[in-house]
Amino acid sequence: LPAQVAFTPYAPEPGSTCRLREYYDQTAQMCCSKCSPGQHAKVFCTKTSDTVCDSCEDSTYTQLWNWVPECLSCGSRCSSDQVETQACTREQNRICTCRPGWYCALSKQEGCRLCAPLRKCRPGFGVARPGTETSDVVCKPCAPGTFSNTTSSTDICRPHQICNVVAIPGNASMDAVCTSTSPTRSMAPGAVHLPQPVSTRSQHTQPTPEPSTAPSTSFLLPMGPSPPAEGSTGD
């Protein structure tokens, strides 16, 4: 004979557990129904009556099958430097994600609590380590033979051109100026060469974090308010 299906609430067999989407109520000592995502337990079960569930109120949620007495509060609204990538509903919490040009300075379990603007390296300094989702740009002074003439969170130090005849010598923030018609690019120590992306628009490039490998390109287009440029100390 097939085993009878027990309807909640029911007393479990000794040593057995309650079924999926059920929980054991210690007070009633019965297996009782959980509430579905988007709901919470309004009235707990007894020996004779099952759990009574109710919908979560506005700005609260439950993501899992549960028997909590109150739904969880959604996180605060996203700030102006964030995008709401997941809305607060009865079944899910709000997720805020930093806008381009910002990184997450204080993470949450999901999304970001506090965003900060990516540092911009000033002329004479280039990107030593690019920004990531959770770390800022690291700038370094341009080594001899290289320069950066931009204030940017993505530009690296580039090699000076080599002139047959130098009109103006290059420095950390300016390329050399040649009188010759056919300058070449130096292969100065520490200079980094990046292949340019195929694009008619100006395109920033970003070195890969590993210092031992030749950098490749990724597409990073910062936006938002300009944070302070990297100071002359290079820190």
């Epitope: 899910q92 994600t97 930093c98 990184y103 993470s107 990073l220």
Partner: nanobody, 118 residues
Framework: EVQLLESGGGLVQPGGSLRLSCAAS????????MGWFRQAPGKEREFVAS????????NYADSAKGRFTISRDSAKNTVYLQMNSLRPEDTGVYYC???????????WGQGTQVTVSS
Amino acid sequence: EVQLLESGGGLVQPGGSLRLSCAASGRTFSSLFMGWFRQAPGKEREFVASIRYPGLITNYADSAKGRFTISRDSAKNTVYLQMNSLRPEDTGVYYCAAAPTGRAFNYWGQGTQVTVSS
């Protein structure tokens, strides 16, 4: 390394439709969120839509709700933005973006131009 390449932009009349595509290569499709942003001439880049994977949870800017639909085809490593009932104010460069852990959009494509004009 993540690379994103948008396509599908063009000139369309008001009320018309376009479907933008964003082909992803590298680690992108383990990204928690993919999104579309746009930048109109002389304006800041603004959020249009995002999609979470897995679960395919979507979110839209108010200006896109009811007209635009974001979708994702993991088999083709592509994210789409279906744009209907286009208006002149939808004109701009549309960028695809990735937020690998959902904390910050730090990977970007080069953009595709959308012009809505009669």
